[in-house]
């Protein structure tokens, strides 16, 4: 399948001019090769009329241009003072020859249709209201008024000044006069359809001396806007339908054959297969809205439709806006695993794409809950503090430069389960879905700290050790101090484990980690984990709690630190705003209620996460070594 | 709320050509009607041709009809007024209205206008 893009069918009218729009995949190669546009022939042999080397055919000459837009990943063809000899059929396509990756366009140029004279015009959209003005003689005041429609044979009346409605217009035609004038009437006709297009006669009067007006109403399905988008990326509808429709339920549905199946409204509707990946967001009081869908697949091409009305389904009559999605699979987006799998207790490293041409951009993670239109509540991000009720168990690693951040979670429970999705504040397309599943573990976790009960004495060297299995062995072993901005990873000394090896003795493979002395502010959770290179692996959480000597003490932890703090399931995630006191740098980009809140997130704070001294200080040493 | 800016107008021979150019910003067009009127000084503005942007439907005015063309681009949100074979009886103010439909041949159905642009016809 070509993953060239454009209009299948473009019409025009002889003299006027049309603008073609093809879409082509974000590559170097694409945005510099030839672009064509090219005649098709009865042979099969595409003749090229324009193309971006500079050709330009004689029958377009003076009259036509191409024009590349590598920065949109699309090239526009311009032809004026269309002729009907024009209408033919077309390739717009990207190659040093026309058996390139191409997309096929008919263009029809129909002769110029003449508006009917003596006759007033009305064009509007489905959905929308037209009010017909129908002017009449003084003489006729006293006379009934009425508008009926042209059929074949007849005229069929619509209202009449006598209160008779014809069935289909109940509760959709209205006649009236305004004020004083008495020289003309209005019929209003709401809830437009195809249906009502056509030829109308105002009335005035009856026989010779009658006021007659023809009246030419135009219904116009809306045309559909075309979205290039490439798999595994995200797309935004944005349905704006008017004021006149703030009120009522939202949907966003699919096509298919002759109905549209609904995709997610206002009402709570939503299709299982966009389960975890969809937002319906209201934006304003005029009727605004949008939807976002991430996790783009190839099946999600195809024509949408969003509207409104009560019963959040489409219904007839009512306004509408239409979309065709193409799904591009040649994407620049990587497959990543859309589903993480992860155990009680145990951890999970999720690896987030992102844009590599924005490295600097900041990086979020959220959880994405279905109850009412969606939400997304941002847990971390580079310059959000982590969420309360995940302290000491979620961080997020940024790797500039190369195209992926990681973000850990670890001490997992099973309410842990559901969708995150990534996300950052620039290239939108960049957003990504994992599914995480938590089962119950079956087995002793992979790394394990001792003691389990950390209580660390103010003053006094203490230590801790992970334990790690050979099949760790090869892996960097590392200890980070995790705080609300990220995991603080402690200068490590390697105590000579590593010498060539033929066995691999299960008990003794551990990495402590030593607080010498200790400190007040040594107190909080640390993080053993594994990695190679730039890539985490698995983790494990401790509490260590300070406490000043006491004569006699147990050094028991008093509340047992280690067991994660519970969360409470009453607690409402704050889907808006990050709570005050939580984070004071940063709005949470939350449900994406306002895309702009998560453009702007980069300028609300200039302090950086990643910083931090990485030595000691003080006189104290803050070490992790590998045996 | 529509905006719409003329240009084009000048001094032309008899006989000679221009053509006038009425870009809209602001809104799409396309459920409106777009006409073009003129106005000489010392008499009433007066219709010269319209069309329907949705679909290209258009008229032309019997003192004009067979030398003015109107037409449309529909990526520019731009209508054109091709004046060929220009007589001094042409000169005129030309604006360029929008209308959401009725009486297309009348000014009162026209709610934005240009600010004009005009045309000047030397014998």
């Known amino acids: 399948k070509s993953p060239i893009f454009g209009p299948q069918e473009v019409s025009s009218i002889e003299g006027d001019s049309v603008s073609i729009t093809c879409y082509y995949p974000d590559t170097s190669v694409n945005r510099h090769t030839r672009k064509y546009w090219c005649r098709q022939g009865a042979s099969g042999m595409c003749t090229t009329l324009i193309s971006s080397n500079g050709y330009l055919s004689k029958e377009y000459s003076g009259r036509a241009n191409l024009i590349n837009f590598p920065e949109n990943n699309t090239f526009v063809i311009n032809i004026e003072q269309l002729t009907q000899d024009d209408t033919g059929s077309y390739k717009c396509g990207l190659g040093t020859s026309n058996r390139g990756l191409s997309f096929d366009v008919s263009l029809e140029v129909s002769q110029v249709p003449e508006l009917p004279s003596d006759t007033h015009v009305y064009t509007k959209d489905i959905g929308r209201n037209v009010t017909i003005e129908c002017p009449f003689k003084r003489e006729n005041a006293p006379s009934k008024k009425s508008l009926c429609k042209k059929t074949n044979q007849s005229c069929e009346l619509v209202i009449d000044s006598t209160e008779k409605v014809n069935p289909s217009y109940i509760g959709r035609a209205k006649l009236f006069m305004k004020g004083t004038d008495l020289t003309v009437f209005y019929v209003n006709i709401s809830h437009l359809t195809h249906n009502d297009a056509g030829l109308y006669i105002c009335q005035a009067g009856e026989g010779p001396s009658a006021d007659k007006k023809n009246v030419d109403l135009q219904v116009l399905a809306p045309e559909p806007e075309l979205l290039y988008k490439d798999l595994r990326s995200s797309v935004t509808f944005e349905c704006d339908l008017g004021r006149e429709v703030a009120n009522e339920a939202k949907y966003l549905c699919r096509m298919n054959k002759e109905t549209c199946d609904v995709i997610i409204n206002t009402l709570g509707k939503r299709d299982p297969d966009f389960e975890g990946r969809i937002l319906i967001t209201p934006k304003d009081d005029n009727g605004r809205f949008s939807v976002l869908i991430t996790g783009l697949r190839k099946e999600d091409a195809g024509h949408y439709q969003c509207g409104a009305h009560s019963s959040g389904l489409p219904q007839e009559g009512w306004p509408i806006q239409t979309w065709q999605l193409f799904v591009n699979e040649e994407s620049t987006i990587p497959n990543r695993r859309s589903v993480v799998k992860g155990v009680t207790g145990g951890s999970v490293a999720i690896a987030c794409p992102y844009n590599p041409k924005e490295s600097s951009s900041l990086k979020y993670w959220c959880r994405w809950e279905g109850d009412g239109n969606g939400h997304c509540p941002v847990l971390v991000g580079t310059q959000a503090q982590v969420q309360e009720e995940y302290e000491g168990r979620l961080a997020l690693f940024d790797q500039p430069g190369n195209g992926t951040y990681t973000v850990i979670l670890n001490q997992l429970t099973t309410e842990d389960a559901g969708f995150y999705w990534c996300l950052t504040n620039g290239d939108s397309r960049w957003r990504t879905t994992i599914e995480l599943q938590v089962a119950e573990a079956t087995r002793e976790p992979n790394l394990e700290v001792t003691p389990q009960n950390a209580t660390a004495v103010l003053g006094e060297t203490f230590t801790v050790s992970c334990h790690y299995p050979c099949k760790f062995y090869s892996q960097e072993k590392y200890w980070c101090k995790w705080s609300n901005k990220g995991c603080h990873i402690l200068p490590s000394h390697d105590e000579g484990a590593r010498q060539s090896s033929v066995s691999c003795d299960q008990s003794s493979q551990l990495v402590s980690m030593t607080l010498n002395p200790v400190s007040k502010e040594d107190e909080g959770w640390y993080w053993c984990g594994v990695k190679q290179g730039q890539t985490y692996g698995e983790t494990t959480a401790i509490y260590i709690a300070v406490e000043e000597r006491t004569r006699g003490s147990s050094h028991v932890n008093p509340t047992d630190a280690n067991a994660r703090a519970k969360v409470a399931l009453e607690e409402e995630v704050v889907d808006s705003s990050i709570s005050e006191k939580e984070n004071k740098a940063i709005p949470n980009p939350g449900p994406f209620a306002n895309e702009r809140e998560i453009q702007n997130v980069g300028d609300q704070a200039q302090e950086n996460r990643a910083s931090g001294d990485a030595g000691s200080a003080d006189g104290q040493s803050r070490s992790s070594s590998s045996k | 709320q529509v905006q719409l800016v003329e240009s084009g107008g000048g001094l032309v021979q008899a006989g000679g050509s221009l053509r006038l150019s009425c870009a809209a910003s602001g809104r799409t067009l396309r459920s409106y009607i777009v006409g073009w009127f003129r106005q000489a000084p010392g008499k009433e503005r007066e219709f010269v041709a319209a069309?329907?942007?949705?679909?290209?439907?258009?008229v032309t005015a019997d003192p004009v009809k067979g030398r003015f063309t109107i037409s449309r681009d529909n990526a520019k949100n731009t209508v054109y007024l091709q004046m060929d074979s220009l007589k001094p009886e042409d000169a005129a103010v030309y604006y360029c209205?929008?209308?959401?439909?009725?009486?297309?041949?009348?000014?009162?159905?026209?709610?934005?206008w240009g600010q004009g642009t005009l045309v000047t016809v030397s014998s």
């Open positions: 069309v329907t942007w949705s679909d290209g439907r258009r």
């Open positions: 209205a929008v209308s959401r439909g009725g009486a297309y041949e009348y000014s009162r159905a026209y709610e934005y």
